[in-house]
């Protein structure tokens, strides 16, 4: 990616944070071995990565969760990467689904999402899951990031 | 990525290699449809990718494995992407976990890890797994790479 | 990635399309929140991404599928990222495998593939699966893309 004043590198990698909130939107923090290249990408309210410059971005998320078929709803565990652009409807960019494990007390599984998308100035991306209480927050298990092409 | 003498492309993609070693660190080779852009990234001792230049890198690994719940330990199969920097603690960058399958003789599963990290000159990244004997080495199943932003 | 006439950004992200064809090659479309940076990458016949310029590309695919162990063959569900270069044999770049779920009527699982590869002018990449009828085409579940470094 280009260096220099005109084309600074823009990249972020943030780390999952356990939350007492009941929202399905995952929470993130600048902790551990995080990346925040500069102020052209920011973590807002601990829940969304917001970019200042229009362009193509590779956006990714990884979610590790622990669930059990009997203790969970019939529906699978779904992780969604979503986009919020000024003056636009929110939209789903990417989703992944994993059926719950039969392992007890729960079985761990990992999901990885990633794709190239055009973002507008002020656009934000965030990650939704069906059940945040099942997400694993141990070192390296759940993270979220982007890089500008 | 920038071209030219100042900013050559730096990228690598290496292919898994079965090993008789008892170590949990996976072994890799420059074989098949591998990538090694230049000597600014090297595969050392068949186990780690080492970079010469500081900067932001997107680092990824994919591991396919075949395991059975009854024949394996209670603990899930875990793949870890780890970092070694001169004079620093080794650290876990990313991890993924999958509970063993009940399929017999074993059930195949694939894990993908990827994220953006700042690497120092001389830094090395490597992949650890809980049980290397369960890793699948068929064409394309298990690989490891990086690209400099 | 480089901007300017000499080094335009090259990137694509296409969305899965259900198909009545019996082929194992997945079908894609420029629909929804797709990306097609310019005519240096094109979607051909709805099945392959073709590039005009030689270089290193990060290529990725995500496939979500729903299968059941009893209703499926013994073999796992396999997704393969394949390369077709002018005057060359086709080759497998990446593969991932997931054993079928015991959930009924079927259990959803997601696979992610990604890696850095050198492509020649006119090279095409496509995605093969063992059973296209099991692939999930809901918003964001199955996608395919690349970006030139």
């Amino acid at each position: 990616m280009q260096k220099g004043d005109q084309n600074p590198q823009i990249a972020a990698h943030v780390i999952s944070e356990a939350s007492s909130k009941t929202t399905s939107v995952l929470q993130w923090a600048e902790k551990g071995y995080y990346t925040m290249s500069n102020n052209l990408v920011t973590l807002e309210n601990g829940k969304q990565l917001t970019v200042k410059r229009q362009g193509l971005y590779y956006i990714y998320a990884q979610v590790t969760f622990c669930s059990n078929r009997e203790a969970s709803s019939q529906a699978p565990f779904i992780a969604s990467l979503c986009l919020k652009s000024p003056g636009r409807f929110e939209r789903i960019l990417l989703r992944a689904a994993n059926t719950h494990s039969s392992a007890k007390p729960c079985g761990q599984q990992s999901i990885h999402l990633g794709g190239v998308f055009e973002l507008q100035p002020g656009a934000s991306v965030f990650v939704n899951v069906t059940d945040p209480s099942q997400v694993s927050h141990g070192t390296g298990f759940t993270s979220f990031g982007l890089l500008k092409l | 990525m920038q071209k030219g003498d100042q900013n050559p492309q730096i990228a690598a993609h290496v292919i898994s290699e079965a090993s008789s070693k008892t170590t949990s660190v996976l072994q890799w080779a420059e074989k098949g449809y591998y990538t090694m852009s230049n000597n600014l990234v090297t595969l050392e001792n068949g186990k780690q990718l080492t970079v010469k230049r500081q900067g932001l890198y997107y680092i990824y690994a994919q591991v396919t494995f075949c395991s059975n719940r009854e024949a394996s330990s209670q603990a899930p199969f875990i793949a870890s992407l780890c970092l070694k920097s001169p004079g620093r603690f080794e650290r876990i960058l990313l991890r993924a976990a999958n509970t063993h399958s009940s399929a017999k003789p074993c059930g195949q599963q694939s894990i993908h890890l990827g994220g953006v990290f700042e690497l120092q000159p001389g830094a090395s990244v490597f992949v650890n797994v809980t049980d290397p004997s369960q890793v699948s080495h068929g064409t394309g199943f298990t690989s490891f790479g990086l690209l400099k932003l | 990635m480089q901007k300017g006439d000499q080094n335009p950004q090259i990137a694509a992200h296409v969305i899965s399309e259900a198909s009545s064809k019996t082929t194992s090659v997945l079908q894609w479309a420029e629909k929804g929140y797709y990306t097609m940076s310019n005519n240096l990458v094109t979607l051909e016949n709805g099945k392959q991404l073709t590039v005009k310029r030689q270089g290193l590309y990060y290529i990725y695919a995500q496939v979500t599928f729903c299968s059941n162990r009893e209703a499926s063959s013994q073999a796992p569900f396999i997704a393969s990222l394949c390369l077709k270069s002018p005057g060359r044999f086709e080759r497998i770049l990446l593969r991932a495998a997931n054993t079928h779920s015991s959930a009924k009527p079927c259990g959803q699982q997601s696979i992610h593939l990604g890696g850095v590869f050198e492509l020649q002018p006119g090279a095409s990449v496509f995605v093969n699966v063992t059973d296209p009828s099991q692939v999930s085409h809901g918003t964001g579940f199955t996608s395919f893309g690349l970006l030139k470094l």
């Epitope: 990698h13 600048e30 071995y33 990346t35 927050h137 | 603690f89 876990i92 | -």
Partner: nanobody
Framework: EVQLVESGGGLVQPGGSLRLSCAAS????????MGWFRQAPGKEREFVAV????????LYADSVKGRFTISADNSKNTAYLQMNSLKPEDTAVYYC????????????????WGQGTLVTVSS
Amino acid sequence: EVQLVESGGGLVQPGGSLRLSCAASGSMSSINAMGWFRQAPGKEREFVAVIYSSDGSTLYADSVKGRFTISADNSKNTAYLQMNSLKPEDTAVYYCAAEPYGSGSSLISEYDWGQGTLVTVSS
């Protein structure tokens, strides 16, 4: 800044065991990780083991895997290195180090260091 004090070094025969301790003054809550490095005469300081405070995950140098075990007791603000099956090549000064929180990948945070404790493995 955290003050670190090591203890437990000494002379031991090959095949023997030692347990090193590293006591931290102040709160462990400001520490992201604690671990051990070692420096043999005429060699560079090398990583031995680390434990991360967020979930107790550990990593070891290849040369000590299966022989050394790192642990921490947060209530005592202390990290330990249990060293078994010691070999002459384990002879070195062992240093405890602590990495502060908030050390992102884009900055090389300064570690806090102990003064070191000598381990000699010889018959």
